[in-house]
Interface confidence: low
Amino acid sequence: TGADTEAVVCVGTACYTAHSGKLSAAEAQNHCNQNGGNLATVKSKEEAQHVQRVLAQLLRREAALTARMSKFWIGLQREKGKCLDPSLPLKGFSWVGGGEDTPYSNWHKELRNSCISKRCVSLLLDLSQPLLPSRLPKWSEGPCGSPGSPGSNIEGFVCKFSFKGMCRPLALGGPGQVTYTTPFQTTSSSLEAVPFASAANVACGEGDKDETQSHYFLCKEKAPDVFDWGSSGPLCVSPKYGCNFNNGGCHQDCFEGGDGSFLCGCRPGFRLLDDLVTCASRNPCSSSPCRGGATCVLGPHGKNYTCRCPQGYQLDSSQLDCVDVDECQDSPCAQECVNTPGGFRCECWVGYEPGGPGEGACQDVDECALGRSPCAQGCTNTDGSFHCSCEEGYVLAGEDGTQCQDVDECVGPGGPLCDSLCFNTQGSFHCGCLPGWVLAPNGVSCTMGPVSLGPPSGPPDEEDKGEKEGSTVPRAATASPTRGPEGTPKATPTTSRPSLSSDAPITSAPLKMLAPSGSPGVWREPSIHHATAASGPQEPAGGDSSVATQNNDGTDGQK
């Protein structure tokens, strides 16, 4: 939906416009941008008051607003991926038109940390409360809305347009109507200040078409930082009214002649300007010629003035305006220097923190220090960084390489390590054999055992080759079955790997392994990894033996 300008307030060198209309923050910014502005900044209490005034104007005219709470976009946003910074007044948000972090803020509530999506700020107006100056609109952050679906709670937005300067409103000395058209396409008949390059149409008379006179003026820069309409004397003057109508349009005094004519005059200490209407102080500082925080200092005999800047600022080429001194040019910091209005601050690169000898010094952050290590197992601190390592039997894993994942030796790149059954464990593995076979002393091979229906052989002994050095994973105990399988595999050479061929009699019943003695008598049915017997169930951590099974349907289970 579109947005209509409902209200405008011009003050200092800026105009603020308030608009109603349900738009996303991007659409609102685009609307402001089309007319040469941006979503409004609220960089100080004074600016917050100007914005509140324009919203007050809008709400006065917007009878349709029924919601108790109203929200209006301003130009404060945080990009996707940029995280909250609780130490800053703007909490990591920044003004859309650019500019440094500003000290003023008025957050509605504490912000939740989220870096996932773009966040935008709106002014929250509680319409059940009067718009009193002591009750400035709070800042509310949230999703930025999307075109066509901006969220039903956002009622509008506020734009800001900046100008070189302003003209005083035109003064009428008799009945008439002034209509100002601003460079940002707003028309108004009442502005406290009228922005540079605005047009003014003056229709004199009391509405009677025959008597109406029209005048057209443009707000121009007459001299550096001096803006006026180029009009001379009050407009729409009428002998019928003399000084009685709007003080004759005069800024201060109005002096009537006997014939109904009149002249404007000024009080002591003031002088009449070229427009013959406006009075200006004879004190050169009274017109506030100094800008940007500069202080006006009167010269000898009050005849001229100089501008003086606060610490951290210097006069620009005009000698009227203060500009920030870039202290970072002198490289006062060990790593990163951020220039700020009136000063600077030192920052450290990622992996470093403020500290060490000297002002602005940085020292390495020991990421591996007790209680702060990001690594699952081993951590090695380096200058400005760190790296993680894993114990034997584990490899680095995770997106950031801080986690450790068990190596499944039973499916290793070199093929199975066991001749027959292979049992993977956390950080290790062990071998086993099919019924009728026993594990050789090397812990890998299987040899034909006595023709008894025994269970698959359990894990190797401590010195056996299958156990990895340094593993802390509990070992499974050899188990005795209550009954063996109904048949035995075909006779094969003692060192060969017997295959689980389709005619093998073991397919008629599942292989089982009893829980180790001392453990609860629980049957578990692990699955076999591969088509060959050289794989086996993963042994759960904690020492419970799993039971190797071949599925009754002849297919292998999945680990």
């Epitope: 008051q49 104007q57 006065r60 319409l127 009193l132």
Partner: antibody, heavy 120, light 111 residues
Framework: QVQLQQSGAEVKKPGASVKVSCKAS????????MHWVRQAPGQGLEWIGE????????YYNQKFKGRVTMTRDKSTSTVYMQLSSLTSEDTAVYYC?????????????WGAGTTVTVSS | DIVMTQSPDSLAVSLGERATINCKAS??????????LNWYQQKPGQPPKLLIY???NLESGVPDRFSGSGSGTDFTLTISSLQAEDVAVYYC?????????FGGGTKVEIK
């Protein structure tokens, strides 16, 4: 010229309600807030509340909440103030006064006042 | 609520002499460089009339013998040269916070 014309004096019994009117003329009715202020005999001024004639928003002094209702009729540029559950302490002159919309809401134009007497 | 305390309760001044009325707020009524403090004059049988707004701004049509000053919590209304028509009760009022509150009034008479 700007004027606020109030309704005539009222005599009410305790527990009853009174509705006082204030008709605005000489200015744009919806561009100013309308306030109600009362003054008990020999006493000072007490703000009751305000109404925005544009959107009909009302803000009341907590002291009167639940007893006061302010309404407006845009077609006749009239604002009404109704006070219920009257007691003898509500005997006062009730004034309507306008203020600018924002900021320093000083009362630049006042009605002549309506005397409300609560007596059994 | 902000309590507005006026002093004195009554004041008798000779014609042509200066009259000074004080008003003290229980908390500051200043905001962004402005004082949200207004003065009214009430004559017997009439509604109050605005004299001064924002502590020191003279309302249109009010004689310039009336002036206001002060900021924060302490404010003063001065009548530089008392005239017979100035006999009235004067009230201060704050409009910075709800509820809008008035002082108890100061009665000015001719000595």
């Amino acid at each position: 010229q700007v004027q606020l014309q109030q309704s005539g004096a009222e005599v009410k019994k305790p527990g009853a309600s009174v509705k006082v009117s204030c008709k605005a003329s000489g200015y744009t009715f919806t561009s100013y807030w309308m306030h109600w202020v009362r003054q008990a005999p020999g006493q000072g001024l007490e703000w009751i509340g305000e109404i925005d004639p544009s959107a009909s928003y009302t803000y009341y002094n907590q002291k009167f909440k639940g007893r006061v209702t302010m309404t407006r009729d845009k077609s006749t540029s009239t604002v009404y103030m109704q006070l219920s559950s009257l007691t003898s302490e509500d005997t006062a002159v009730y004034y309507c006064a306008r203020s600018v919309y924002y900021g320093n809401k000083y009362f630049d134009v006042w009605g002549a006042g309506t005397t409300v007497t609560v007596s059994s | 609520d902000i309590v507005m305390t006026q002093s004195p309760d009554s004041l008798a001044v000779s014609l042509g002499e200066r009259a000074t009325i004080n008003c003290k707020a229980s908390q500051s009524v200043d905001y962004a460089g402005d004082s949200y403090l207004n003065w009214y004059q009430q004559k017997p049988g009439q509604p109050p009339k605005l004299l001064i707004y924002a502590a020191s701004n003279l309302e249109s049509g009010v004689p310039d013998r009336f002036s206001g000053s002060g900021s924060g919590t302490d404010f003063t209304l001065t009548i530089s040269s008392l005239q017979a028509e100035d006999v009235a009760v004067y009230y201060c009022q704050q409009t910075n916070e709800d509820p809008r509150t008035f002082g108890g009034g100061t009665k000015v008479e001719i000595k």
